[in-house]
Interface confidence: low
Amino acid sequence: EGAAQPNNSLMLQTSKENHALASSSLCMDEKQITQNYSKVLAEVNTSWPVKMATNAVLCCPPIALRNLIIITWEIILRGQPSCTKAYKKETNETKETNCTDERITWVSRPDQNSDLQIRTVAITHDGYYRCIMVTPDGNFHRGYHLQVLVTPEVTLFQNRNRTAVCKAVAGKPAAHISWIPEGDCATKQEYWSNGTVTVKSTCHWEVHNVSTVTCHVSHLTGNKSLYIELLPVPGAKKSAKLY
């Protein structure tokens, strides 16, 4: 059976980074559908990172709706029974099985648009989404391994003499912490049941000519650097500054 794959040149586009306003899509427009129709033979599952609290649109293979018999979206989320949303063109009827998340809906009426939307993506939307289009020419598939990205909250503080602690709290996936200049560091990771990870890096600098240190946090949602002046007095507190 044939299957559709996304155009390799397509890029994930995010319009804004504001909560609940940003919108991500891997969909092709009608021109791309026409241009790429002859190339869409091999089934490909796309790994797709999506920022939490954005809106995501997942697309079916670029098959003209006039050639359609049945569209089925299969949604497999962690700890949930498989949910299916189906549309049968002949009877113009939609059917849902085991679908409880009201944020996951058809973009519009499925006879007009077969795409699926997730409104305000949450951690619980991590999972596998597959569109199966049944046509007279065969079945066409497109699958997405959706990875929800959560921006960690970054803090930096000095807790002892010439020792600083940098924390990237509740990120998904885990953030990476590096220091300038390098110190004597220990890094711990705390895993949460919802899939987020808190990374804590504690560093000590013996060299007394080091007065300012920078914590750099790298994450798929973006990087952040904070710096702090090391205080020689034990127990003194100093707040971090953002670059």
Epitope: A20, L21, A122, I123, T124, V169, W192
Partner: antibody
């Protein structure tokens, strides 16, 4: 069926402490952020505090910062609010509420527990 | 004083359309999802509209939400006596790192 049941309210003197609990059932507790919202008699809703799914991120309204502590025990499906240094203006019905994420809506609410701070 | 501003009261007759406004700023309504809650007398609040304009299942399509810039509106068409309640708008405030409510609007069905 999603259920949130608050307990621990009552009459307390100014400066006193109370610990509210919210027992959750009917859903996977650790998949949701939780919040406390209060409503003084005859007044509007006021958000008090929120905690992320795993409990690592906590947020507080300025009016309770330093006095109230939110926590959760995912193994017991329970949300807590430790209230210290209580004032007369903390008198309210306290609701616990569930949300998909901290910054989003509360899709389910408990029925509330009344806290009265008075001498 | 509430961070989000709502009219304290609104009224209408059965069958009418009523609109309740909610005004905020770029740190809340402007850049975050707006939610509306309905609180019937003597009961806990109930989710009415989320993500600016989406209805949970079970909420009649007489209720609709909209947002433009730093303002949001709740519209109730075909007003019924059972719609008599307090209505609250709310949103996350990125500057405060907290959730903010409007002062509430008491809707009276005449």
């Amino acid at each position: 069926e999603v259920q949130l049941l608050e307990s621990g309210g009552g009459l307390v003197q100014p400066g006193g402490s109370l610990r509210l609990s919210c027992a959750a059932s009917g859903f996977t507790f650790s998949d949701y952020a939780m919040s406390w919202v209060r409503q003084a008699p005859g007044k509007g809703l006021e958000w008090v505090s929120a905690i992320s799914h795993g409990g690592s991120s906590k947020y507080y309204a300025d009016s309770v910062k330093g006095r109230f502590t939110i926590s959760r025990d995912n193994s017991k499906n329970t949300l807590y609010l430790q209230m210290n240094s209580l004032r007369a203006e903390d008198t309210a019905v306290y609701y616990c509420a569930r949300g998909p994420e901290v910054m989003l809506e509360f899709d389910y609410w408990g029925q509330g527990t009344l806290v009265t701070v008075s001498s | 004083q509430s961070v989000l501003t709502q009219p304290p009261s609104a009224s209408g007759t059965p069958g009418q359309r009523v609109t309740i406004s909610c005004t905020g700023s770029s740190s809340n309504i402007g850049n975050n999802a707006v939610t509306w809650y309905q609180q019937l007398p003597g009961t806990a609040p109930k989710l009415l509209i989320y993500s600016d304009n989406h209805r949970p299942s079970g909420v009649p399509d007489r209720f609709s939400g909209s947002k433009s810039g730093t303002s949001a509106s709740l519209a109730i068409s075909g007003l019924r006596s059972e719609d008599e309640a307090d209505y609250y708008c709310a949103a996350w405030d990125s500057s405060l790192s907290g959730y903010v409510f409007g002062g509430g609007t008491k809707l009276t069905v005449l």
